[in-house]
C-alpha cells in the first residue's frame, strides 16, 4: 500500500532520491517453500510485474514520505497446485526520469524475502516488510482460478446436474459425481504405479522405490559405483569420489553434476531420474511444466515435448535463465516474468528489446505527409493540413478553431478549410469588409469572431 | 495452450477500410507485442508494424505508415489491424504474431485472406 | 532500413541430402554490448503459417528437430539441414529483429 523510507532510520530520504521525477515497480517472485535463497534463484511458482505505474514527482525541502501506491494488483498465475507454504520475494525498482537525472536509470531499491504459509481461498493477509531503510506496505492472497477449488485448488469441482449429497455451497467434483472433493493432485512425473500423495505437490514411494518421483528401484536406488544399497534408513555406505562415477544414466543419458547430486538429460523417449522409463507414451504425460506433447502415440514412436517460454529440456525439466542473454538494449532492464521475457525501456526507447529510438526521426515516420522535426533531443510531427496528433494519424477538423472571421461559415475540405464570407466581406478568411463605392477592400476590425490563421495541428 | 486466432476472411472494395482481428488465449497479453505481417503471393513476408498492448504504443515500417494502424483491447485480449485506402495491392494474407524479449515471433495466427475487388 | 536478401530462391534435393542455405543482411545483426546476433529463421509449409526454428541466430527453438542447424554472425547467415527429410517441403524465411523487422525473400525447398 505504500512504499518509502523506515521510521527511525536516520534522515528520511525519497524513493525519488531527490533527483527528480521517478516511478516504482514492483517485482514479485513465487518460490517454493522449501527452497534456499542462495540455491534457488528462479521463480519456480510464478512471477510477475506492476502495471499500474504512477510518476512521482519529489518537491525540494519536502519532507521524504512513504509513496502511495496504486490500487492495481499484481496478478501471479502459478503453475500446478498451490503449494500452501512458499517463499515470497518482493523487488522494488526504482526508474529515474527527466533528463538530468544523471547516474543509473534503473536501481533495485529493496528486495525483501519471506516464508509464508497461505491457503487458497483465503482473505487478504497483510504485512510490513523493512529491508536497509526501506519499509514496503503491502497485502497479499492466493485464489484458485475455476475450476480448481480448495485450500491447494487441487480439486476440479465443475457444476454437475446430479444430485448431491454435498454440504450447501459445495458442488460435487469430477470425476467422482458422490464426491465432494477429488483426489489431491501429485508433483508432476510422481510415478502412478510406484508413488502416491495425500497432499498437493507431494510424491510418497510404495515399498521397493525411491526418489523425488519414486521411479527408482531401491535395489539400485541412488548408490553408485562401489556404493551398496544399505537399510532403507541409512541409504548409501561408502561414499564415492562423484555423483557421475559410472554414469548413472541409463538408456544414452548423459550426467551433470548438480550441487553434490546428479541430473541425467535423457535422449527422446526415455525419462526418469536416470533415464529409466521407457516405452513412454503422451497418455503418460511427460512433457513438466506446461509443455506440449506431439506424436508418440504408442510405446514404440518417440514423442516430442514442444516446451513454453523459459524452459527446455526434452521434457522441458529445465527452467532456462533468459535475462542472462541480455537482450534489451538501449539501456533497457531485463525482467523475467516466468511466462515471457519483458524489457523495460529508458524513457525515449521502445520496442520488444527497447530497438526503437522515439527521438530520433530515423526511428518513426510521421505519417499523412507529416514532416518530422528533430530539436533538444527530441522529436515531433510536424503535421499536414487537416491532420493531426503525435504522428498525424487523426483526421483534424480545420474548422474546430473557427477561423472565419465577421460570420463567415466554416466548411472543411479534402485540401484544409474554406470560408464562405457572409456579405460585405471577403477574403480566405472573411478578413476584408467589401466598400461599397467599389474601392478596395480593407481589413476589417474584428466583430465578435476573432481573425486567425491557417491552423495546424501539431 | 497458446493461440491467436484471427477473423475470417474478407472482399472488400478499392478504396474501402477494413478491420482484422487477432484474439489472443493462453498467454498474458500485456506481456507480449503483437505484430502484423502481409504475405502476398510470390512477395514474401512484409512486416507492417508492432503495438504493446501494456500502452498501446505502435511503431509501423514507414511504407505502412499512411495505410495501416494498429490497436489494441486489453479487456478482450484482441489486437486489430486497421486497413485504409484499399487497392489490388492490399490483396494479401495478414497474419498476427506474438514477440516477447526472448523469442521473436513465437507464435502466429492462421492468418486472414484479404481481397480487394470491384 | 535494413535489407535481407536470401539464396537461393529455390533449390531441389533428394531425401537425406545435405542443404544449406544463405541469408545476408545489408548491416551488422551482432548487438555489441551482448555478442548476439538479432535473426531468426522461420519454416512455412504450403497452406500453414511460418514457424519459428531458429533464433538468436543459432538457438534451435523447442521441438524443432537437430538436423536444422543455424550459424553465423554480423551479416553472413547460414540455415543447414544435415539429411533432409520430406516433411522439409516448405520455404524457408530470415528475419532481422535488431531494428524494426524485415524478412529476406524466402528460400523454396523442393524434393526430387
Known amino acids: 500500500h505504500s512504499f518509502g523510507p523506515g521510521p527511525g532510520l536516520g534522515t528520511p530520504r525519497s524513493p525519488c532520491n531527490a533527483r527528480g521525477p521517478c516511478r516504482l515497480f514492483f517485482r514479485v517472485c513465487l518460490k517454493p517453500g522449501v527452497s534456499q535463497e542462495a540455491t534457488e534463484s528462479l521463480c519456480a511458482l510464478g512471477a510477475a510485474l506492476s502495471t499500474s505505474v504512477p510518476v512521482y514527482t519529489e518537491h525540494p525541502g519536502e519532507s521524504a514520505a512513504a509513496l502511495p501506491l496504486p490500487d492495481g494488483l499484481v496478478r501471479v498465475p502459478f503453475r500446478d497446485a498451490w503449494p500452501g507454504t512458499f517463499s515470497l520475494v518482493i523487488e522494488t525498482w526504482r526508474e529515474q526520469l527527466g533528463e538530468h537525472a544523471g547516474g543509473p536509470a534503473w536501481n533495485l531499491l529493496a528486495r525483501v524475502v519471506g516464508r509464508r504459509r497461505l491457503a487458497a481461498g483465503g482473505p487478504w493477509a497483510r504485512d510490513v516488510q523493512r529491508t536497509g531503510t526501506w519499509e514496503l506496505h503491502f497485502s497479499y492472497r492466493a485464489r484458485c482460478e475455476p475450476p480448481a477449488v480448495g485450500a491447494a485448488c487441487a480439486r476440479l469441482c465443475r457444476s454437475r446436474s446430479a444430485p448431491s449429497r454435498c454440504g450447501p455451497g459445495l458442488r460435487p467434483c469430477t470425476p467422482f459425481p458422490d464426491e465432494c472433493e477429488a483426489p489431491s493432485v501429485c508433483r508432476p512425473g510422481c510415478s502412478p504405479e510406484h508413488g502416491y500423495c495425500e497432499e498437493p505437490d507431494e510424491c510418497r514411494c510404495l515399498e521397493g522405490w525411491t526418489g523425488p518421483l519414486c521411479t527408482v528401484p531401491v535395489s539400485t536406488s541412488s548408490c553408485l559405483n562401489s556404493r551398496v544399497p544399505g537399510p532403507a534408513s541409512t541409504g548409501c555406505l561408502l561414499p564415492g569420489p562423484g555423483p557421475c562415477d559410472g554414469n548413472p544414466c541409463a538408456n544414452g543419458g548423459s550426467c551433470s553434476e548438480t550441487s553434490g547430486s546428479f541430473e541425467c538429460a535423457c535422449p527422446r523417449g526415455f525419462y526418469g531420474l536416470r533415464c529409466e522409463v521407457s516405452g513412454v507414451t503422451c497418455a503418460d504425460g511427460p512433457c513438466f511444466n506446461g509443455g506440449l506433447c506431439v506424436g508418440g502415440e504408442d510405446p514404440d514412436s518417440a514423442y516430442v515435448c514442444h516446451c513454453p517460454p523459459g524452459f527446455q529440456g526434452s521434457n522441458c525439466e529445465k527452467r532456462v535463465d533468459r535475462c542472462s542473454l541480455q537482450p534489451c538494449q538501449n539501456g533497457g532492464l531485463c525482467l523475467d516474468l516466468g511466462h515471457a521475457l519483458r524489457c523495460r525501456c529508458r524513457a525515449g526507447f521502445a520496442g520488444p528489446r527497447c530497438e526503437h529510438d522515439l527521438d530520433d526521426c530515423a526511428g518513426r515516420a510521421c505519417a499523412n505527409g507529416g514532416t518530422c522535426v528533430e530539436g533538444g533531443g527530441s522529436r515531433r510531427c510536424s503535421c499536414a493540413l487537416g491532420f493531426g496528433g503525435r504522428d498525424c494519424r487523426e483526421r483534424a477538423d480545420p474548422c474546430a478553431s473557427r477561423p472565419c472571421a465577421h460570420g463567415g461559415r466554416c466548411y472543411a475540405h479534402f485540401s484544409g478549410l474554406v470560408c464562405a464570407c457572409a456579405p460585405g466581406y471577403m477574403g480566405v478568411r472573411c478578413e476584408f469588409a467589401v466598400r461599397p463605392d467599389g474601392a478596395d477592400a480593407v481589413p476589417a476590425a474584428p466583430r465578435g469572431l476573432r481573425q486567425a490563421d491557417p491552423q495546424r495541428f501539431l | 495452450e497458446v493461440q491467436l486466432q484471427q477473423s475470417g476472411a474478407e472482399l472488400v472494395r478499392p478504396g474501402a477500410l477494413v478491420k482484422l482481428s487477432c484474439k489472443a488465449s493462453?498467454?498474458?497479453?500485456?506481456?507480449?507485442?503483437i505484430h502484423w505481417v502481409k504475405q502476398r503471393p510470390e512477395l514474401g513476408l512484409e512486416w507492417i508494424g508492432w503495438?504493446?498492448?501494456?500502452?498501446?504504443?505502435?511503431i509501423y515500417d514507414p511504407k505502412f505508415q499512411d495505410k495501416a494502424s494498429i490497436t489494441a483491447d486489453t479487456s478482450s485480449n484482441t489486437a486489430y489491424l486497421h486497413l485504409s485506402s484499399l487497392t489490388s495491392e492490399g490483396t494479401a494474407v495478414y497474419y498476427c504474431?506474438?514477440?516477447?524479449?526472448?523469442?521473436?515471433?513465437?507464435?502466429w495466427g492462421q492468418g486472414t485472406l484479404v481481397t480487394v475487388s470491384a | 532500413d535494413i535489407v535481407m536478401s536470401q539464396s537461393p530462391s529455390s533449390l531441389a534435393v533428394s531425401v537425406g541430402e545435405k542443404v544449406t542455405m544463405r541469408c545476408k543482411s545489408s548491416?551488422?545483426?551482432?548487438?555489441?554490448?551482448?555478442?548476439?546476433?538479432?535473426l531468426a529463421w522461420y519454416q512455412q509449409k504450403p497452406g500453414q503459417s511460418p514457424k519459428l526454428l531458429i533464433y538468436?541466430?543459432?538457438t534451435r527453438e523447442s521441438g524443432v528437430p537437430d538436423r536444422f542447424t543455424g550459424s553465423g554472425s554480423g551479416t553472413d547467415f547460414t540455415l543447414t539441414i544435415s539429411s533432409v527429410k520430406a516433411e522439409d517441403l516448405a520455404v524457408y524465411f530470415c528475419?532481422?529483429?535488431?531494428?524494426?523487422?524485415?524478412f529476406g525473400g524466402g528460400t523454396k525447398l523442393e524434393i526430387k
Open positions: 504474431a506474438s514477440e516477447d524479449a526472448y523469442y521473436p515471433f513465437a507464435y
Open positions: 493462453g498467454f498474458n497479453f500485456k506481456d507480449y507485442y
Open positions: 503495438i504493446d498492448p501494456e500502452n498501446g504504443n505502435a
Open positions: 548491416q551488422s545483426l551482432l548487438y555489441s554490448s551482448n555478442q548476439k546476433n538479432y
Open positions: 538468436w541466430a543459432s
Open positions: 528475419q532481422q529483429y535488431y531494428s524494426y523487422r524485415t
